[in-house]
Amino acid sequence: VPRWRQQWSGPGTTKRFPETVLARCVKYTEIHPEMRHVDCQSVWDAFKGAFISKHPCNITEEDYQPLMKLGTQTVPCNKILLWSRIKDLAHQFTQVQRDMFTLEDTLLGYLADDLTWCGEFNTSKINYQSCPDWRKDCSNNPVSVFWKTVSRRFAEAACDVVHVMLNGSRSKIFDKNSTFGSVEVHNLQPEKVQTLEAWVIHGGREDSRDLCQDPTIKELESIISKRNIQFSCKNIYRPDKFLQCVKNPEDSSCTSEI
């Protein structure tokens, strides 16, 4: 007799999830010698332990603490790049500017990037059919709680000048409900962080507006200033040229505004 299974509104666990996490861990330790001490089997066991046999709407940050402990990593606190709704460009940037780090350049972020996972209460099975959607089902689901936990820790670790890449093509360039707006902004430590510098990425070729004057950017500035952190903002009018100039700073065309 088939057992009744909860149907959630979101997509199910990414296929071959355990193998993917293990494989990513192996690859990460290969590429990053400073993380060679990590036991990938223990990492997988801790990851699995955070959500297996638990109700997928009842996950807590505490569930992820064993994983957080195993994935503890020191990144240069003054080289942190946050992003909101513009992940691909942020990752392209840190692939070129190797001394800067997004969350997904850390072990834990790398393991989980673009994956979905959830379990079921009282069974050791992974649910490959459906997982809770943040809006339609519940916010305390395994994926959302994971990203909230690692994002908070990442922001707490930041110091000096922290950069954030924002998508200038969106109606809300700064969105209070994004992970950046709801978690990271509020966990930057004013005693360590001097400045938050926003890079607003333009989408259109002919877009010469100063998007740093956008009302949502002003809202971000207000939130940051109230937290006793300085705020600065730059328009990146030509993201393609911006990346090219990061790769080749000596290029003659890279002295003009990008």
Epitope: P18, L22, A23, V26, T29, H37, D39, C40, Q41, W44
Partner: nanobody
Amino acid sequence: EVQLLESGGGLVQPGGSLRLSCAASGFTFSSYAMSWVRQAPGKGLEWVSGISNRGVNTYYADNVKGRFIISRDNSKNTLDLQMNSLRADDTAVYYCASGKGWDGNTWYEDYRGQGTLVTVSS
């Protein structure tokens, strides 16, 4: 190029011991889980034992638990299998394999060596 070279096989009497070794090269040994699998004459492949990349976690098939011990030396890129209380049904070609690890049901294997023959007979 990944290379896994097993050694230490041979003929041993029931109740005896044997130590198999595997020399690994061509990859970052300390990043990979390692395992031993075997194939008895006329039978399919059977997973025997596995060890995580840092040696923190070890796993054994039920029929070898308490008799076999898997170990690794990441400084020398070697994997060992100490086999005690050997029985006739342990007779097989033993292969060393590199992989990603164990998810509770499946051992994820990437590469396998050429194997070494263990014969348990009086």
